[in-house]
Interface confidence: medium
C-alpha cells in the first residue's frame, strides 16, 4: 500500500513581517523597507501606502501593517480606509449621501461638520424672535412683550436645538 506523505509548504512557517524568498531557497526574509506582510506564509510583501497631497499619515507603515491615512484640515475621509478626501461642507450646509447640501429653511448649521438643526422655537419659552435665523445661525430669542419692563433682561441665549431624527414629510 502507498503511504500518504504530508507535504507541508515551507513558506507556511514564514511569519507576518517576512516573505518566503524563492530566490534564497524559500527561507523567510524580512520585508524590505516601505513594504509589509500582515499575514504569515506570503511570497511577497506589499508596498506600503503613501499618504501624499491632501492625505496625511495617521499611522506609519510597519513590517506587519500598512500605513493608514486621514485627511488634511478642511477635508474629511470618504470610502473604505479613507480612500478619498472630500472638502468639508461650509457653514449653512450638511453632508448627505449626495455630498454637501444647503440647510433648508428653518434649519441651520454653524459648523463645517455635522447636521442642519431646527431653529429654536422661541415661543415654546414664551419668548419672541429678536434676530431671525439663517442657514448659518440660529434665531436669537428675546423677551416676550410682557417682559419688556425696566430691569428686564433684553436677550436670552437660545435653548439648544435638537435634530428631530426623522425625515421631513
Amino acid at each position: 500500500f502507498e503511504r500518504t506523505r504530508s507535504l507541508q509548504d515551507p513558506c507556511s512557517n514564514c511569519p507576518a513581517g517576512t516573505f518566503c524568498d524563492n530566490n534564497r531557497n524559500q527561507i523567510c526574509s524580512p520585508c524590505p523597507p516601505n513594504s509589509f506582510s500582515s499575514a504569515g506564509g506570503q511570497r511577497t510583501c506589499d508596498i506600503c501606502r503613501q499618504c501624499k497631497g491632501v492625505f496625511r499619515t495617521r499611522k506609519e507603515c510597519s513590517s506587519t501593517s500598512n500605513a493608514e491615512c486621514d485627511c488634511t484640515p478642511g477635508f474629511h475621509c470618504l470610502g473604505a480606509g479613507c480612500s478619498m478626501c472630500e472638502q468639508d461642507c461650509k457653514q449653512g450646509q450638511e453632508l448627505t449621501k449626495k455630498g454637501c447640501k444647503d440647510c433648508c429653511f428653518g434649519t441651520f448649521n454653524d459648523q463645517k461638520r455635522g447636521i442642519c438643526r431646527p431653529w429654536t422655537n422661541c415661543s415654546l419659552d414664551g419668548k419672541s424672535v429678536l434676530v431671525n435665523g439663517t442657514k448659518e445661525r440660529d434665531v436669537v430669542c428675546g423677551p416676550s412683550p410682557a417682559d419688556l419692563s425696566p430691569g428686564a433682561s433684553s436677550v436670552t441665549p437660545p435653548a439648544p436645538a435638537r435634530e428631530p431624527g426623522h425625515s421631513p414629510q
Partner: antibody, heavy 125, light 112 residues
C-alpha cells in the same frame, strides 16, 4: 399617519422566489433617500439586504445578496418590493422594510428612522 | 465584507446601573460618524436611539448617549430603567465603490 406595511406569502418552498411588497403611507417618494429591506432570522441579529434610491432608482445590495436579490419601486402605487431567488431554509426570517432618514434638504443620511412591523417568511417544503 | 462586532454579546444589569456597549467596525464608517444605535424588544421592529454617532433621536430619553469615531463607538445608558431591557444594535453606513450598510452583532441587556 406615516407608516410602512410589509405584505407577501408567509411560506415559500425551497428553490423558489420570495416576493414581498412594502406599502408606504403618509409620505411619498419625492426625495433622494433610500427605501431598504432588512431581515432577522429567528433568534438572530439584523441583516441588511439592500436599498433603492427613490430619486434615481439606483440599487445597493449586500454582497451575499448580489445576483439573488432585486429591489424595485413603483412610485405610482407608493410601494416598493423585494424579490429573493433560489431560497433555502437559511432565508427563513422576519423581513422588515425601512426608510432611510432624510436630511433637512431631503437627502439620505444613512440611518433608518421608520420601520415596518416585519413579516415572517418561512422557507419549507 | 464589513464586520461590526458588539461587545458584550449579552449582559445582566440592575435598574439604576450604568451600562456601556461597544461597537467595533472592520472599516471606518462614512465621514467617521455615520453610525446609529437601535433598541429592539421581542416581536417588535428596531427603534432608532442615536444617529451620527452622538445625536439623540426624537423622543429618546437623555439617559442614552453615544460617542466614538471612525471604527470604535460606544452606547451608554447612564441609569438603566425597567423599559431599557432589550437588545441593542449598532449600524454603520459605508462608501467604498458603492453605498453599503451593516448591523452589529447585537447586545442583549437582561435583568440581573
Amino acid at each position: 399617519q406615516v407608516q410602512l406595511q410589509e405584505s407577501g406569502p408567509g411560506l415559500v418552498k425551497p428553490s423558489e422566489t420570495l416576493s414581498l411588497t412594502c406599502k408606504v403611507s403618509g409620505f411619498s417618494f419625492n426625495n433622494d433617500y433610500d427605501m431598504c429591506w432588512i431581515r432577522q432570522p429567528p433568534g438572530k441579529g439584523l441583516e441588511w439586504i439592500g436599498c433603492i434610491d427613490t430619486g434615481d432608482g439606483s440599487t445597493y445590495y449586500a454582497s451575499w445578496a448580489k445576483g439573488r436579490v432585486t429591489i424595485s419601486v413603483d412610485s405610482s402605487k407608493n410601494q416598493f418590493s423585494l424579490k429573493l431567488s433560489s431560497v433555502t431554509a437559511a432565508d427563513t426570517a422576519v423581513y422588515y422594510c425601512a426608510r432611510e432618514a432624510a436630511s433637512s434638504s431631503g437627502y439620505g443620511m444613512g440611518y433608518f428612522d421608520l420601520w415596518g412591523q416585519g413579516t415572517l417568511v418561512t422557507v419549507s417544503s | 465584507d464589513i464586520q461590526m462586532t458588539q461587545s458584550p454579546s449579552s449582559l445582566s444589569a440592575s435598574v439604576g446601573d450604568r451600562v456601556t456597549i461597544t461597537c467595533q467596525s472592520s472599516q471606518s464608517v462614512y465621514d467617521n460618524n455615520w453610525l446609529a444605535w437601535y433598541q429592539q424588544k421581542p416581536g417588535k421592529a428596531p427603534k432608532l436611539l442615536i444617529y451620527r454617532a452622538s445625536n439623540l433621536a426624537s423622543g429618546v430619553p437623555s439617559r442614552f448617549s453615544g460617542s466614538g469615531s471612525g471604527t470604535d463607538f460606544t452606547l451608554t445608558i447612564s441609569s438603566l430603567q425597567p423599559e431599557d431591557f432589550a437588545t441593542y444594535y449598532c449600524q454603520g453606513t459605508y462608501l467604498s465603490s458603492n453605498w453599503y450598510w451593516a448591523f452589529g452583532t447585537g447586545t442583549k441587556v437582561t435583568v440581573l
